[in-house]
Amino acid sequence: AGVFELQIHSFGPGPGPGAPRSPCSARLPCRLFFRVCLKPGLSEEAAESPCALGAALSARGPVYTEQPGAPAPDLPLPDGLLQVPFRDAWPGTFSFIIETWREELGDQIGGPAWSLLARVAGRRRLAAGGPWARDIQRAGAWELRFSYRARCEPPAVGTACTRLCRPRSAPSRCGPGLRPCAPLEDECEAPLVCRAGCSPEHGFCEQPGECRCLEGWTGPLCTVPVSTSSCLSPRGPSSATTGCLVPGPGPCDGNPCANGGSCSETPRSFECTCPRGFYGLRCEVSGVTCADGPCFNGGLCVGGADPDSAYICHCPPGFQGSNCEKRVDRCSLQPCRNGGLCLDLGHALRCRCRAGFAGPRCEHDLDDCAGRACANGGTCVEGGGAHRCSCALGFGGRDCRERADPCAARPCAHGGRCYAHFSGLVCACAPGYMGARCEFPVHPDGASALPAAPPGLRPGDPQRYL
């Protein structure tokens, strides 16, 4: 166990041209606060994936009012550290997201309004117990300077906070089987502390806080004997003594969710569904009110005037979750038609259309002929984003300005043969097709399999295109 600590040093305009506008004004004074989200490993996960290592909100900073005409300075910051406690081992590699939020203090209906000013993210290696690491991150025209460290909470020590140390009971040496705790040579490595209540007779642990059962015993604290009449659980190896399947510890055994949260197993771990007023990986963060700004991504907080009453986050479009913390991937519904590229901008969906298509969802096939002229008696044919001219006999090219072979453009459909005729283009249709350009199958379910001349038609006859 331990604590990740984040110290914000400054938030203000970055170097270079294009200084950002001050987020506050005389008419709308505001103050800043920060949110940090930590995830284990060097994950490339999206910003909305769970903060599995933990998250924290800062206090609100001092109220700031812009001085007219003055450049945006570094903005006044909240006091103190942001602290993210972690219960298990420190992973050594982690990903972070630090969000800078603005709380507007004008006379909005329903209280203050929150909006996200900047979000920075990164992936770092960090050993617990080491010195403060300094960092600078830029988000658009803003620059954030901060330091961070991970420290173990006694009695845990080490780069991952997994070793436990106790002060020496005797001045000269540690107890039997226990080594000195480097670098704290005046302390001794302590025996592992299993999960509180773990049966000393039937349970054991290899990691702090766990409780693994000896054969024949089960339950979160290894206090329940496995009987042959209740061989129901498929989890775990077969017991030699009872012939039963002995359940191994599952991620939800003992319900790791605090404050009445309900636990559900996921493929890799577990997930807590927290009651209102609680959040965090294990529903351990409590007493949240609207004053704490629990609604992210511009969500509006309603209710929750005191720690005992619930709050509700009304999420803006594109976000969901009890704290508006999850971004809705609206592009997964493939709303853009005709091969358009979907862009989820948060506040709106955009479709970037392929040439020849338009509309909010690329649903309109453009009439590319509008305002186009084809020379020498040609007619304009739309399609594919570039107008084409269907040229009169003897002309070709994009605008029918060039003399051309009238059959070069393959004007006869469905394998019809083209002939340049003195009075116009002629298509000799394949059996089973008709029309000036053989574009109509006589029997579409099997045109080419029909007899060459169905009754009432002579599809092989040339159809003159005048």
Epitope: D367, C380, G435, R437, E439, F440, Y465
Partner: nanobody
Framework: EVQLVESGGGLVQPGGSLTLSCAAS????????MAWYRQAPGKKRELVAG???????AYIDSVKGRFTISRDNAKNSVYLQMNSLRAEDTAVYYC???????????WGQGTLVTVSS
């Protein structure tokens, strides 16, 4: 993507008249070759009448002089005016489009025409 919606089908007595409409979206009908097909129960779908992109028309012999295919560019629709209807004209009538730029074919869902006394 061209989409076609037929309307105007129904029950009519022998010798009566009916006009079928086909509304197109996604492309201008003036740039498409359009046609009407029909499929009677137990039979193959067959061409009835077609109108090419240049306006020239084609009909099967059994409907010549009775059916007329036409196009209204302003309404982006194609019509089949059917006169002197006979019992053998009973079928589901389908609208068809052939797009020259992509050489693709498109079909409507069909509308039922029943000629019966």
């Amino acid at each position: 993507e061209v989409q076609l919606v037929e309307s105007g089908g129904g029950l009519v007595q022998p010798g009566g008249s009916l006009t079928l409409s086909c509304a197109a979206s996604g492309s201008s009908v003036s740039n498409l070759s359009m046609a009407w097909y029909r499929q009677a129960p137990g039979k193959k779908r067959e061409l009835v009448a077609g109108i090419s992109a240049d306006g020239s028309t084609a009909y099967i012999d059994s409907v010549k002089g009775r059916f007329t295919i036409s196009r209204d560019n302003a309404k982006n629709s194609v019509y089949l005016q059917m006169n002197s209807l006979r019992a053998e004209d009973t079928a589901v009538y389908y609208c068809y489009a052939y797009r020259w730029t992509t050489r693709r074919t498109y079909w409507g869902q069909g509308t039922l025409v029943t000629v019966s006394s």
